[in-house]
């Protein structure tokens, strides 16, 4: 059975075998099509999610469509019915947690009272000022936070305490790529770790441990990506696996925040990589042990510069490394995360290609994760 | 695009009162305060008091407590400030002004174009 | 009621100069502070909240510093339309209260 099962796919009505590489191959070879039902899925970007979180104390803003113009939620009336639509319209299906929190002086967006119509926010019409000079803080799920926080080294191995989002992507057993957790049913990642295999049996996810072999692996129900664009083959390396069965988080198994839409990182902003990728370049071994570095973000204009990567960094993509080289991610660290830390860790960005490893003008770039958050929310949604 | 359009001047006597208006346009009128400032001949801005538009509550400098009154009428998107007892100090050019976000402490932004009011005898 | 103090009530300078004016409050106002601009005859026009914070369609030549009890606003280099009469204010409580002017003149 193992080994019919590793190399053969069974069809049903009539029940027959046909050789697992015809699977997602684009190709209906079973009567019924099943075999390009579980395969890796494209998602167009979609519209835009008319509520959003901001990195000011996590304070929800809401977009008046007629005017395509962002407003801050005022406190004034709301309830836990809203902070559950405004979570729900960002795909979040567990319970919110929501608080007052001042007007600072530099507010600068205007203020309004929300309301709901058709389960999605709306400014209240006939409103008038915001009395409690007050703003909504949201927070649509607990998140980025660790037993443990890192000492800031070089390259170090890592416990799971410190980083309990992270997971191990694997196909057939094998360690292929990193994932993150962000919430009981979603693990983030980067599409091209499922260039090679489009099918979604043989996926599985390990979370829970530092160590490569030693946790118990989850079975995947869907496998998500963006639509290719070949203008920028580059972009778009994110990818979002849907587990078959929600996690149970504990001390080892807790999500990290997504950022927030305005988390604009400045150059030499301290990051973090976590990975089990190759410890050298070429050197052709994955690490048995996670590993854990501290980064810094590195200025784009740096990063597209002649002797770098000539323009190849786009808007949607970040770098980041450490100026005299060295430190980076590497083969196998692929689609693990770039981390920030302010209250809590988020994912900034995902590990997504490089030149080399460690070179001083090549650092890694990354998939910069504000930039998707839209197409996250979409997705989410869908799939509530 | 937002527009305060105030009244005109007005000459009164020591002791009469004077009424002034500030008609809003372009934008939803009872989602913001608006304040009434005045300027003296050649002198400085002294804040008088705010009005919140939705609700009719209103606030005042102590110097003008028991003087003044603001009221604003919604179907006309209109507000008003009455000063009585005129004293020749009293003239000034007398300023509405809307502020810049739908909360209290946000500066003022938009101005009327003003309103000269003389208290001579 | 907090006073505002600005220095100098006047001063005279030239096209392309850089021009500081200092406003100080009798207690703290955090970045509680506005600026504005007024020309004779004319409303008052906002050129600058939360202390440093410049108003959307402002020209960034103006620029605003400062938090606690000191601020300053900063022309970097003077225009012939910036010849007129500016103005701090203080937010964080009632009744609002604004400095006594400065007058820019042309030297």
């Known amino acids: 059975k193992v080994i019919l099962d590793k190399y053969y796919f069974l069809c049903g009505q009539p029940l027959h075998f046909i050789p697992r590489k015809q699977l997602c191959d684009g190709e209906l070879d079973c009567p019924l099509g099943e075999d390009e039902e579980h395969c890796v899925k494209s998602f167009p970007e979609g519209p835009a999610v008319a509520v959003r979180l901001s990195k000011d104390r996590s304070t929800l803003q809401v977009l008046d469509s007629a005017t395509g113009n962002w407003f801050s939620a005022c406190f004034d009336n709301f309830t836990e019915a809203l902070a559950e639509t405004a979570c729900r319209q960002m795909g979040y299906s567990s319970k919110p947690t929501f608080r007052a929190v001042e007007i600072g002086p530099d507010q600068d967006l205007d203020v309004v009272e929300i309301t709901e119509n058709s389960q999605e926010l709306r400014m209240r019409n006939s409103s008038g000022p915001c009395l409690s000079g007050s703003l909504v803080s949201l927070h649509c799920l607990a998140c980025g936070k660790s037993l443990k926080t890192p000492r800031v080294v070089g390259v170090e191995e890592a416990s799971v305490d410190s980083w309990p989002w992270q997971v191990s992507i694997q196909y057939d057993k094998q360690h292929v790529c990193g994932g993150s957790i962000l919430d009981p049913h979603w693990v983030l990642t980067a599409a091209h770790c499922f260039r090679k295999h489009t099918d979604v049996f043989n996926w599985k996810v390990r979370a829970g441990s530092d160590k490569l072999g030693s946790f118990p692996s989850l079975a995947v129900a869907k496998i998500i990506i963006i639509e290719f664009n070949p203008m920028y083959p580059k972009d778009n390396d994110i990818a979002l696996m849907k587990l078959q069965f929600p996690l149970t988080f504990s001390g080892t198994v807790r999500p990290i925040c997504l950022p927030f839409f305005d988390e604009e990182l400045t150059p030499a902003t301290p990051l973090w990589i976590i990975g089990w990728g190759f410890t050298k370049q070429n050197g052709g071994k994955m690490s048995d042990i996670l590993l854990q570095a501290s980064v810094q973000v590195i200025d784009s204009t740096r990063c597209n510069a002649d002797d770098a990567y000539q323009g190849e960094v786009t808007e949607k993509m970040m770098c980041a490394g450490i100026p005299e080289g060295g430190v980076d991610t590497c083969q196998g660290d692929s689609g693990g995360p770039l981390m920030y830390q302010s209250d809590q860790w988020h994912v900034v960005g995902i590990v997504s290609w490089g030149y080399g490893c460690g070179g001083p003008s090549t650092p890694g770039v990354y998939t910069k994760v504000s930039a998707y958050l839209n197409w996250i929310y979409n997705v989410w949604k869908a799939e509530l | 695009q937002v527009q305060l359009v105030q009244s005109g001047a007005e000459v009164k006597k020591p002791g009469a009162s004077v009424k002034v208006s500030c008609k809003a346009s372009g934008y939803t009128f009872t989602r913001y305060y608006m304040h009434w400032v005045r300027q003296a001949p050649g002198q400085g801005l002294e804040w008088m008091g705010w009005?919140?538009?939705?609700?009719?509550?209103?606030n005042f400098a102590q110097k003008f407590q028991g003087r003044v009154t603001m009221t604003r009428d919604t179907s006309t998107s209109t507000v008003y400030m009455e000063l009585s007892s005129l004293r020749s100090e009293d003239t000034a050019v007398y300023y509405c002004?809307?502020?810049?976000?739908?909360?209290?402490?946000?500066?003022?932004?938009?101005w009327g174009q003003g309103t000269l009011v003389t208290v001579s005898s | 009621d907090i006073q505002m103090t600005q220095s100098p009530s006047s001063l005279s300078a030239s096209v392309g100069d850089r021009v500081t004016i200092t406003c100080r409050a009798s207690?703290?106002?955090?970045?509680?502070l506005a600026w504005y601009q007024q020309k004779p005859g004319k409303a008052p026009k906002l050129l600058i909240y939360?202390?440093?914070s410049l108003q959307s369609g402002v020209p960034s030549r103006f620029s605003g510093s400062g938090s606690g009890t000191d601020f300053t606003l900063t022309i970097s280099s003077l225009q012939p339309e910036d010849f007129a009469t500016y103005y701090c204010q203080q937010a964080i409580s009632f009744p609002l209260t604004f400095g006594g002017g400065t007058k820019v003149e042309i030297k």
């Open positions: 009005i919140n538009p939705n609700s009719g509550v209103t």
């Open positions: 207690q703290s106002i955090n970045t509680w």
């Open positions: 002004a809307r502020v810049r976000i739908g909360w209290l402490q946000s500066p003022p932004l938009y």
């Open positions: 939360a202390a440093s």
